[in-house]
């Protein structure tokens, strides 16, 4: 006869490990007892259990409550046992010693491999600002056994670098993603992808990029100067800019206080019916936590009567 077992048994942390040991004997041969022990080199041997054909399972004090027989139906030649709730410390060599009648004793060894799935964590780098050079966008760390694979999934152009730290029974892998921040990256996903044999599918953690910037400011509303004449209603100036975080707007008049009746509504400056006192230099001040910008325009409110008088003069002058 001979013993049938596996060279390697692989389980995920927390699962039950079936340690196989089957005696393939000739007809009439019987298994009297199976002894299971852990036999790591350098770690010392430790009995797990005795499996007696008549009296059943006797688990050693060190493994009490953790070793069971597989559920029925059971073959009397099957000396397999279940190691419940495998932990990382269970990883190692195991020996099955089988006492048979009349053939004598046989033994076989197997290696138990306990996969420890990683629990990845993603840490954003420092605040990203337009105009910076190559900057850390995020780092992703995953520790497991064996060492996990850490990669990045993104449309953003950047560079990655990885490092690994070996511990006694596991390895931690950290990958960093660096980029040159630009406003086009705002809102773009940066996804850390962790692969590991103990995972049914890759684990993904997504970070949304936020790049601080502030665009140049400009003022709209003065495209047609002829519309800015005395008596016109609904005249307004709108300050144009964009930024991250969203900017705030402030209006001032360079050559004095804002005239009475002028309404400030965020990026918009609304005028009452125009008079000549609304003529002046207006400044839009745009700011966010990252920067500030100014844009100024000159408003010249036309008096239609003056304009027509000038025209007559010009005509007669000709």
């Amino acid at each position: 006869g001979e013993l049938e077992t596996s060279d390697v048994v692989t389980v995920v942390l927390g699962q039950d490990a079936k340690l196989p040991c089957f005696y393939r004997g000739d007809s009439g041969e019987q298994v009297g007892q199976v002894a299971w022990a852990r036999v790591d080199a350098g770690e010392g041997a430790q009995e797990l259990a005795l499996l007696h054909s008549k009296y059943g399972l006797h688990v050693s004090p060190a493994y009490e409550g953790r070793v069971e027989q597989p559920p029925p139906p059971r073959n009397p030649l099957d000396g397999s046992v279940l190691l419940r709730n495998a932990v990382q410390a269970d990883e190692g060599e195991y020996e099955c010693r089988v006492s048979t009648f009349p053939a004598g004793s046989f033994q076989a060894r197997l290696r138990l491999r306990v996969l420890v799935p990683p629990l990845p964590s993603l840490n954003p780098g420092p605040a990203l600002e337009e105009g910076q050079g190559l900057t850390l966008a995020a780092s992703c760390t995953a520790e497991g056994s064996p060492a996990p694979s850490v990669t990045w999934d993104t449309e953003v152009k950047g560079t990655t670098s990885s490092r690994s730290f070996k511990h006694s029974r596991s390895a931690a892998v950290t990958s960093e993603f660096h980029l040159v921040p630009s406003r086009s990256m705002n809102g773009q996903p940066l996804t850390c992808v962790v692969s590991h044999p103990g995972l049914l599918q890759d684990q993904r953690i997504t970070h949304i990029l936020h790049v601080s910037f502030l665009a140049e400011a400009s003022v709209r509303g003065l495209e047609d100067q002829n519309l800015w004449h005395i008596g016109r209603e609904g005249a307004m100036l709108k300050c144009l800019s964009e930024g991250q975080p969203p900017p705030s707007y402030n209006w001032t008049r360079l050559d004095g206080p804002l005239p009475s009746g002028v309404r400030v509504d965020g990026d918009t400056l609304g005028f009452p019916p125009l008079t000549t006192e609304h003529s002046g230099i207006y400044v839009c001040h745009v700011s966010n936590e990252f920067s500030s910008r100014d844009s100024q325009v000159t408003v010249d409110v036309l008096d239609p009567q003056e304009d027509s008088g000038k025209q007559v003069d010009l005509v007669s002058a000709s």
């Epitope: 022990a37 036999v39 010392g44 041997a45 009995e47 005795l50 009296y55 006797h58 004090p61």
Partner: antibody
Framework: EVQLLESGGGVVQPGRSLRLSCAAS????????MHWVRQAPGKGLEWVAV????????YYADSVKGRFTISRDNSKNTLYLQMNSLRAEDTAVYYC?????????????WGQGTLVTVSS | DIVMTQSPSSLSASVGDRVTITCRAS??????LAWYQQKPGKVPKLLIY???TLQSGVPSRFSGSGSGTDFTLTISSLQPEDVATYYC?????????FGQGTKVEIK
């Protein structure tokens, strides 16, 4: 056939030392824990010490701790018990016993024993 | 340390009688208990381990039971060759102490 043969017993004065040996045969000595158990004349069994199959772990009864040392030489298939600072109450037949496995700590084979008498 | 107490210390019974020896642990030891037989002038012999598992070659008239703190060795039909002292031993943790023994004689 498993055989365990103790030697080294005798009469010794209190405070002196003695070294017992146990020669093993008939099994793979290096795969089993080994124990010393003693029995005072007309008394019961008292577990004394254990050594693991590879010699890396040793445990002692409180009554002998610090005075007795258990050791083994797997290349010679031999178990030893070094007994120092002997006392009258150490008088007993000393048995070496084979562990049922690596470290089950019960005994399926016993030697014939060697008598140690501590007397002035 | 856990103390193992056997009772009775000695007993006398007739051939064919059913004999029961008890062993009590001062703390629970699950089923980590062995029984040994020591005939006069002989070395101890393993009878039972795991409280109830009969060692190979031991006659089936011997049986063991119990778990936790209370254990029993039973000889279903006492034979003349069973005259001996019987010891229980706990092996869950060091020290691996024995009971004080029970001497069995034939009436």
């Amino acid at each position: 056939e498993v055989q365990l043969l103790e030697s080294g017993g005798g009469v010794v004065q209190p405070g002196r030392s003695l070294r017992l040996s146990c020669a093993a045969s008939g099994f793979t000595f290096s795969s089993y824990g080994m124990h010393w158990v003693r029995q005072a004349p007309g008394k019961g069994l008292e577990w004394v010490a254990v050594i693991s199959y590879d010699g890396s772990n040793k445990y002692y009864a409180d009554s002998v701790k610090g005075r007795f040392t258990i050791s083994r030489d797997n290349s010679k298939n031999t178990l030893y018990l070094q007994m120092n600072s002997l006392r009258a109450e150490d008088t007993a037949v000393y048995y070496c016993a084979k562990d049922y496995g690596y470290n089950w700590n019960f005994f399926d084979y016993w030697g014939q024993g060697t008598l140690v008498t501590v007397s002035s | 340390d856990i103390v193992m107490t056997q009772s009775p210390s000695s007993l006398s019974a007739s051939v064919g009688d059913r004999v029961t020896i008890t062993c009590r642990a001062s703390q629970g030891i699950s089923n980590y208990l062995a029984w040994y037989q020591q005939k006069p002038g002989k070395v101890p012999k393993l009878l039972i381990y795991a409280a109830s598992t009969l060692q190979s070659g031991v006659p089936s008239r011997f049986s063991g039971s119990g778990s936790g703190t209370d254990f029993t060795l039973t000889i279903s039909s006492l034979q003349p060759e069973d005259v001996a002292t019987y010891y229980c031993q706990k092996y869950n943790s060091a020290p691996y102490t024995f009971g004080q023994g029970t001497k069995v004689e034939i009436k």
